[in-house]
């Protein structure tokens, strides 16, 4: 069971300092951006991290949304990352959800975050290069020191 708590506005970067944004095709991508680029591309660079109370404490449960014309929420349905046009619900009556991730700091590095899927144990949000694009994907990972599954989250509130 997940119950919605407060939300915060954040900029999410990979460890190469590329900024996560949602492109015109609703795809989550990473790109090099200056601070002014980041501001100019808002709201596509501003993510709403919705925190949830978890009936089984397993880290900070979050849903990640973005508000462009409408609110879209990050989902890992069938292990595929996409933004679905939906508001994060107030309550989720299950211990797993395709929109809930556990945000945890990397041990010894409070500023580096990992996001593990609540639906798929051992699967993490990751940045992966595909041709010329740096994509946000869901990846099964058993080397947890891999930088591709580490992110920084800068609060914009």
């Amino acid at each position: 069971y997940f119950g919605k708590l407060e939300s915060k506005l954040s900029i999410i970067r990979n460890l190469n300092d590329q900024v996560l944004f949602i492109d015109q095709g609703n795809r989550p991508l990473f790109e090099d951006m200056t601070d002014s680029d980041c501001r100019d591309n808002a709201p596509r660079t501003i993510f709403i991290i919705n925190m949830y109370k978890d009936s089984q404490p397993r880290g900070m449960a979050v849903a990640i949304s973005v508000k462009c014309e409408k609110i879209s929420t990050l989902s890992c349905e069938n292990r595929i990352i996409s933004f679905k046009e939906m508001n994060p619900p107030d309550n989720i009556k299950d211990t797993k959800s395709d929109i809930i991730f556990f945000q945890r700091s990397v041990p010894g590095h409070d500023n580096k975050m990992q996001f593990e899927s609540s639906s798929y144990e051992g699967y993490f949000l990751a940045c992966e290069k595909e041709r010329d694009l740096y994509k946000l994907i869901l990846k099964k990972k058993d080397e947890l020191g891999d930088r591709s599954i580490m992110f920084t989250v800068q609060n914009e509130d």
Epitope: R58, R104, P107, L144
Partner: antibody
Framework: QVQLVQSGAEVKKPGASVKVSCKVS????????FHWVRQAPGKGLEWMGR????????KYAERFKDRVTMTEDTSTDTAYMELSSLRSEDTAVYYC???????????????????WGQGTLVTVSS | DIQMTQSPSSVSASVGDRVTITCLAS??????LTWYQQKPGKAPKLLIY???KLQDGVPSRFSGSGSGTDYTLTISSLQPEDFATYYC?????????FGQGTKLEIK
């Protein structure tokens, strides 16, 4: 309690291949991997590689990648490690081990080699 | 590849002694470090994971500490059954690498 039971000792000639099996008995959760570790007589532990039973993907140590093949038969819960072009330096005890997520009090994951097979001695001698 | 430098390679101690074994990683391994005990002719046995978390059933005289690149295994008061070889393992990145081992012998 998970137990790993390995095949028996083998004596091989240089240039031959050996295939070691590792059978899981007992209840094991999903989301584990099989790793193989070897130990030459009087020496330390050396990681050889791993296989993911979910999709059969493998990761091999660079020094073995041209000679080792790790496979898994989900229907029998058995993992296999085949090493080819054997030489005398491959004389060692070969261990299989499971690689599973353990969690701390905040749910943070750590992968751990927890269950180990009893080891299989492979002797390479002409 | 991440190198794990374990020291000392051997140590002689008496029952009741406090013993410390260290492992130095060639880069940050984010506490993805486990410690194993191995006795002759036996498979390794997990003692500590996540640098400082005691595996169930392991006596509390064993403890682990460290972060970044420096890690320590401490046995607070040696018991006769603790004489064995100890290995650290980094699980941060492939290829996984073990320390060279520390043989703990009776003085």
């Amino acid at each position: 309690q998970v137990q790993l039971v390995q095949s028996g000792a083998e004596v091989k000639k240089p240039g031959a291949s050996v295939k070691v099996s590792c059978k899981v008995s007992g209840e094991i959760s999903t989301g584990y991997y099989f790793h193989w570790v070897r130990q030459a007589p009087g020496k330390g532990l050396e990681w050889m590689g791993r296989i993911d039973p979910e999709d059969d993907s493998t990761k091999y140590a660079e020094r073995f990648k041209d000679r080792v093949t790790m496979t898994e038969d989900t229907s029998t819960d058995t993992a296999y490690m085949e090493l080819s072009s054997l030489r005398s330096e491959d004389t060692a005890v070969y261990y299989c081990t499971t690689w599973r997520i353990y969690r701390d009090s905040s749910g943070r994951p750590f992968y751990v080699m927890d269950a180990w097979g009893q080891g299989t001695l492979v002797t390479v001698s002409s | 590849d991440i190198q794990m430098t374990q020291s000392p390679s051997s140590v002689s101690a008496s029952v009741g002694d406090r013993v410390t074994i260290t492992c130095l990683a060639s880069e940050d391994i984010y506490t993805y470090l486990t410690w194993y005990q191995q006795k002759p002719g036996k498979a390794p046995k997990l003692l500590i994971y996540g640098a400082n978390k005691l595996q169930d059933g392991v006596p509390s005289r064993f403890s682990g500490s460290g972060s970044g690149t420096d890690y320590t295994l401490t046995i607070s008061s040696l018991q006769p059954e603790d004489f064995a070889t100890y290995y650290c393992l980094q699980g941060s990145k492939f290829p996984l690498t073990f320390g060279q081992g520390t043989k703990l012998e009776i003085k």
